[in-house]
């Protein structure tokens, strides 16, 4: 009742290993690390066979098949490169995830290297089986913005890609007869969020309550350069409209809001986020130069119907930008206190413009980003949002534009976006 001699499978072994096997002896077949027992097309860790009464084995010896991790999971905004020849996905094969540069960067500077483990799972030393995260890069336009040495720029055409965070926000309130339409600007913070001024998104209500417009009434255009040609732009509807809970329509204090887009927008040379500043109550330093872009810069007397109807001469057809210095807080406060009317420049605001006038962002669009280049991080940072200006004509002498001081609201913004600040460190000015 002796059974025939057994040969272990290639890359495998049999236990116990004996010279002879008799009736009722049992053998366990297993494979080397990185291989699986394969029997009748079924993968298993081990396989047991028994020497039968008639001197035959209960089953044929199975084979050992190399573990296959199969095709790695797709990485949103990322790419996969195979380190091994023929794009092998078997045990000890290596792949590398990378992000779609220069628009996305891997969180925590992860290597992105994954190895096919003995368990048949792609594993990274730090993240384990979790995929890496590609975060949008911020504040790095595909075209370099002009040097900020020269003092005066005014109403200059922006080349496509100079302000890739610039959003045109069109609001059409169809609940009124006739429909109410207006527009403002905003700044892309991530693939799904736009930062803007609260007054742009406040409903045209009859009273002083702060109610946001219905999300159905909001359309956001990104990657837009010339308002006559929206074909190249990405337009998105809003999933959420969030006004700052303390926004005051009497004095425009806390004039900040967010729009969550219905779908994340694909980033590219003409659509990229701007960086948020550090949380700092001082805001931008006096005399620092910043840039603001908008389609409303050159002519403040045109209706919104004209700007959104393509093919007609409108405001500025092409995105314009203006360069402005930050004004010392005390000087701005004094300039407004000297005017008739109840003007209040709060600690949540800063001013920018020239004493002599001539350049002014009240010529820009409400909600547009006042950006300053940060030398440390070599990125553009949104320090202000176009909020309000004095009663005189735009660009009047000693009438400064007033901006929401974004650095006071960084925590609020992250909270609304549902991201802990540590997760999005690359987004923050360093």
């Amino acid at each position: 009742n002796e059974c025939p001699e057994l040969q272990p499978p290639v890359h495998g072994k049999i236990e116990p290993s004996q010279a002879k096997y008799f009736f009722k002896d049992q053998v366990l077949v297993s494979c080397d690390t990185g291989y699986k027992v394969l029997k009748d097309n079924v993968e298993m860790d081990t396989f047991q066979i028994e020497c039968l009464k008639d001197g035959t084995w209960s089953n044929k010896i199975p084979t050992c098949k190399i573990v296959d991790c199969r095709a790695p999971g797709e990485l949103e905004h990322g790419l996969i490169t195979f380190s091994t020849r023929n794009n092998l996905t078997t045990y000890k094969s290596e792949i590398k995830y990378s992000c779609q540069e220069p628009y996305y960067k891997m969180l925590n500077n992860n290597t992105g290297i994954y190895t096919c483990s003995a368990q048949g799972v792609w594993m990274n030393k730090v993240l384990g089986r979790s995929l890496p995260t590609c975060l949008p890069e911020c504040g790095q336009p595909s075209r370099s913005l002009p040097s900020l040495v020269k003092r005066i720029i005014g109403g200059r055409n922006a080349e496509p890609g100079l302000f890739p965070w610039q959003a045109l926000i069109v609001v059409e309130d169809t609940s009124r007869v006739p429909n109410d339409k207006w527009f403002g600007s905003g700044a892309l913070l991530s693939a799904s969020w736009i930062l803007t001024a609260a007054h742009v998104l406040r409903s045209q209500r009859r009273d002083t309550t702060v109610i946001p417009v219905s999300k159905e009434h909001v359309t956001v255009y990104l990657g837009l350069h010339d308002v006559r040609d929206k074909s190249g732009a990405v337009n998105s509807s809003a999933a959420r409209v969030v006004l700052h809970p303390d926004f005051n329509i009497q004095n425009y204090n806390h004039d900040i809001a967010l729009v969550q887009l219905q779908e994340p927008v694909p980033l590219g040379p003409h659509v990229m986020p701007v960086c948020l500043p550090r949380l700092e109550p001082e805001g931008p330093a006096p005399h620092m130069l910043g840039l603001v872009a908008g389609w409303g810069i050159s002519n403040p007397n045109v209706t919104v119907d004209e700007i959104i109807s393509s093919g007609t001469r409108t405001l500025s057809d092409v995105l314009q930008y203006v360069k402005l210095p930050v004004v010392p807080h005390a000087e701005c406060k004094t300039s407004y206190e000297s005017r008739s009317g109840n003007y209040s420049v709060t600690e949540n605001m800063f001013c920018a413009g020239y004493y002599e006038g001539g350049k002014d962002t009240c010529l820009g669009d409400s909600g547009g980003a006042f950006v300053i280049f940060d030398d440390l991080s070599q990125r553009w940072v949104v320090q202000g949002l176009v909020s309000w200006g004095g009663p005189e004509e735009c660009g009047s002498k000693q009438v400064y534009g007033v901006y929401t001081k974004v650095s006071n609201y960084v925590d609020w913004v992250w909270e609304q976006m549902g991201l802990p600040q540590s997760v999005v460190e690359p987004q923050v000015e360093r």
């Epitope: 609940s175 007869v177 339409k181």
Partner: antibody, heavy 113, light 112 residues
Framework: QVQLVQSGAEVKKPGASVKVSCKAS????????IEWVRQAPGQGLEWIGE????????NYNEKFKGRATFTADSSTSTAYMELSSLRSEDTAVYYC??????WGQGTLVTVSS | DIVMTQSPDSLAVSLGERATINCKSS????????????LAWYQQKPGQPPKLLIY???TRESGVPDRFSGSGSGTDFTLTISSLQAEDVAVYYC????????FGQGTKVEIK
């Protein structure tokens, strides 16, 4: 075409309440504000308030807050205005209108003891 | 509240002549966001509800004869009937909807 048809005339005693209805047709009722305006005999027009039927949002003239209540029934495309604690000076024709453009025919409410 | 003051209170004009009604608001009705003046003009004939003639200060409602025109911005507005017809005899009201809406006291237009 857009039409607003209001309920018939009412005679009420001081202290009572009145509920005026306004049935809309010819457009999407839920998506447009319905305003309420009154006109005392031989007098001018006075805005009472408004309701957006789709959301139930309301805005009131301060003068009528607490006394006027607006409701809307989307299933019948009907808006309602209820005015409580009536006094003789509430005698007027009450109009509903779709935002600014189309007016109902008016409902005369007479408050008399 | 915004106070709307119409002038004159009444106006007698010969048929075919121009009628001009003024409306002054206690604060500007120009909305900086929409760049529109939230002022409307209504016509009311005896026993009828008011009828919208002009909105946004100068936009004529469809179906309204072009002899009716609106002008003005900020706080001063005008309704002009370029050539008065017999059917234009009515009371005319301005209404602001910039804020909690308020009406002017009305201007009665008659034939001289």
């Amino acid at each position: 075409q857009v039409q607003l048809v209001q309920s018939g005339a009412e005679v009420k005693k001081p202290g009572a309440s009145v509920k005026v209805s306004c049935k809309a047709s010819g457009y999407t009722f839920t998506g447009k504000w319905i305003e309420w305006v009154r006109q005392a005999p031989g007098q001018g027009l006075e805005w009472i308030g408004e309701i957006l039927p789709g959301t139930g949002s309301t805005n009131y003239n301060e003068k009528f807050k607490g006394r006027a209540t607006f409701t809307a029934d989307s299933s019948t495309s009907t808006a309602y205005m209820e005015l409580s604690s009536l006094r003789s000076e509430d005698t007027a024709v009450y109009y509903c209108l779709r935002s600014e453009d189309v007016w109902g025919q008016g409902t005369l409410v007479t408050v008399s003891s | 509240d915004i106070v709307m003051t119409q002038s004159p209170d009444s106006l007698a004009v010969s048929l075919g002549e121009r009628a001009t009604i003024n409306c002054k608001s206690s604060q500007s009705l120009l909305n900086s966001r929409t760049r529109k003046n939230y002022l409307a003009w209504y016509q009311q004939k005896p026993g009828q509800p008011p009828k919208l003639l002009i909105y946004w200060a100068s936009t004529r409602e469809s179906g309204v004869p072009d002899r009716f025109s609106g002008s003005g911005s900020g706080t001063d507005f005008t309704l002009t009937i370029s050539s008065l017809q017999a059917e234009d005899v009515a009371v005319y009201y301005c209404k602001q909807s910039y804020n909690i809406p308020t009406f002017g006291q009305g201007t009665k237009v008659e034939i001289k």
